[in-house]
């Protein structure tokens, strides 16, 4: 009688993560007597997957009923795949004995596990950045199978080329993950500007995952001051104001320095925004020049976001002050911060 | 109770091959993967190779492939090594271990042989 | 081939201290550690399987853990015959493969 065969007709099986592989086997002969076991891997470190004779293998349920004296089939289905059951599966005849021996291999079947992606995380730099500077974002997303991977960035739908992707390990795994960095210039304009990272896979059929930062929590638009003179309210008293803008973010405090002596500090409240997200904000200072001898030197001192503080200073002349000298030029900017100086 | 009973210390010429033993006793010879490690004089423990008695499988280190040859004889419960091609950096001692016939975690690398000393001189 | 970073490779201190060696594995190995212990003449006896697990005649201040891709064997209250060298095994994949060793010494 001819010597028994073990037959695995798939070379290779493909299953989704979550869903059941079903590995094939038979034998060509009933003799020897003798159990089945699956094995995945070769060598000592394979693992034990079924053992027809003993044992208990929640995940695995035989095709045919195994136990029938004539039975030839043993086949097994596995169920809930993931990732980590990927590998090449051997069914392995033994001889009934006292231990059981091995007798025959199968040739194996290979087991790919597709696995879909994680949402990707984009996540930004840590400290903020002004516009002109160039920021670094990363991008990651794990667990996929196979190991092949499209990722690409976006910056408010326009392309970005400058990116350096990685994908680990670089060897044979169960699973996969990718890490890639992308340089992104700032503009004063990125208040409302998004970043993309853009991951495609076998698993996602044509259908991309998306993770998004947006630049409003990476820029700092530093404002732009302008005091200016505005015309007289009253018999000696002079209205001085003074513009903070295109800032962001909003946290802003503003002090009032005369001749150089804190006049008054307070914080940015009742602020416009403009449609590109930076903010405007105004201060007014009510002067009494009959309170001064000499010139009185004003200076709007600006601290935004914590940052360095900037000035702008105004030369108010005590000795002639027309009832007109400057102009208020930015209509928009409303403001009602009045305070005397005696 | 199990043992790996080893063959003695060995001298030989650099050029030359020396083939040790390891006489199992104590458990069925052929539900195991017979190991071999080496370890040079003051040195750490490097993994040779294994082989599997009931068909002769046998997996190497890459490093030792070609320096190393695994055969059992099943009837004696014996395994052996030959180390040809003796260098001065094949002086080591010698340990035989086992790994059940499938990754059994229980029983990777318990039971261990004495050592062979291999002392290579010109 | 997977990595076994083994550290200290030295390691001095007394009669009752608790100690801890580690090893770090340079791929994903599971559970699938062992540490042996290795005698001054060359005898080597397993101690601790599938990271954590003791072997029976072991004594109990032995303990393994993992914590991440770290390794630990930890002694609590050194004793005189602790005071060998002692070695990691990785036995996930081929080649399988040891820590450097980290010698025990007595303070």
């Known amino acids: 009688e001819e010597e028994l065969q073990v037959i695995q007709p798939d070379k290779s099986v493909l299953v989704a993560a979550g869903e059941t592989a079903t590995l094939r086997c038979t034998a060509t002969s009933l003799i020897p007597v003798g159990p089945i076991q699956w094995f995945r891997g070769a060598g000592p470190a394979r693992e034990l997957i079924y053992n027809q004779k003993e044992g208990h293998f929640p995940r695995v349920t035989t095709v045919s009923e195994s136990t029938k004296r004539e039975n030839m089939d043993f086949s097994i289905s596995i169920s809930n795949i993931t990732p980590a059951d990927a590998g090449t599966y051997y069914c392995v005849k033994f001889r009934k004995g006292s231990p059981d021996t091995e007798f025959k291999s199968g040739a194996g079947t290979e087991l790919s596990v597709r696995a879909k992606p994680s949402a990707p995380v984009v996540s930004g730099p840590a400290a903020r950045a002004t516009p002109q500077h160039t920021v670094s974002f990363t991008c990651e997303s794990h667990g996929f199978s196979p190991r092949d991977i499209t990722l690409k960035w976006f910056k408010n739908g326009n392309e970005l080329s400058d990116f350096q992707t990685n994908v680990d390990p670089v060897g044979e795994s169960v699973s996969y993950s990718i890490h890639s960095t992308a340089k992104v210039v700032l503009t004063r304009e990125d208040v409302h500007s998004q970043v993309i990272c853009e991951v495609a896979h076998v698993t996602l059929q044509g259908d991309p995952l998306r993770g998004t930062a947006n630049l409003s929590e990476t820029i700092r638009v530093p404002p732009t001051l302008e005091v200016t003179q505005q015309p007289v309210r009253a018999e000696n008293q002079v209205n001085v104001t003074c513009q903070v803008r295109k800032f962001y973010p909003q946290r802003l405090q503003l002090t009032w320095l005369e001749n150089g002596n804190v006049s008054r500090t307070e914080t940015a409240s009742t602020v416009t925004e403009n449609k590109d997200g930076t903010y405007n904000w105004m201060s007014w200072l009510l002067v009494n020049v009959s309170a001064h001898r000499d010139d009185v030197k004003l200076t709007c001192q600006v601290e935004h976001d914590g940052q360095p503080a900037v000035s702008k200073s105004h030369d108010l002349k005590v000795s002639a002050h027309p009832k007109e000298q400057g102009s208020n030029t930015a209509a928009e900017n409303t403001g009602s911060n009045e305070r005397n100086i005696y | 109770e199990v043992q790996f009973q080893q063959s003695g210390t060995v001298l030989a010429r650099p050029g030359t091959s020396v083939k040790m033993s390891c006489k199992a006793s104590?458990?069925?010879?052929?539900?195991?993967?017979m190991h071999w490690v080496k370890q040079g004089p003051g040195q750490g423990l490097q993994w040779i190779g294994a082989?599997?008695?009931?068909?002769?499988?046998?997996t190497y280190n890459q490093k030792f492939k070609g320096k190393a040859e695994l055969t059992v004889v099943t009837s004696t419960s014996t395994a052996y090594m030959e180390v040809s091609s003796l260098t001065n950096e094949d002086s080591a001692v010698y340990y035989c271990t086992r790994s059940f016939y499938y990754s059994l975690d229980a029983a990777w690398f318990v039971y261990w042989g004495q050592g062979t000393l291999v002392t290579v001189s010109a | 081939d997977i990595q076994m970073t083994q550290s200290p490779s030295s390691l001095s201190a007394s009669l009752g201290e608790r100690v801890s060696l580690t090893c770090r594995a340079s791929q994903d190995i599971g559970s699938r550690l062992n540490w042996l212990q290795q005698e001054p003449d060359g005898t080597i006896k397993r101690l601790i399987y599938a990271t954590s697990s003791l072997d029976s005649g072991v004594p109990k201040r032995f303990s393994g853990s993992r914590s991440g891709s770290d390794y630990s064997l930890t002694i609590s209250g050194l004793e005189s015959e602790d005071f060998v060298d002692y070695y990691c095994?990785?036995?996930?994949?081929?080649?399988?493969?040891f820590g450097g060793g980290t010698k025990l010494e007595i303070n």
């Open positions: 082989i599997y008695p009931v068909n002769n499988d046998t």
């Open positions: 104590g458990s069925t010879f052929t539900s195991y993967w």
């Open positions: 095994l990785q036995y996930a994949s081929s080649p399988f493969t």
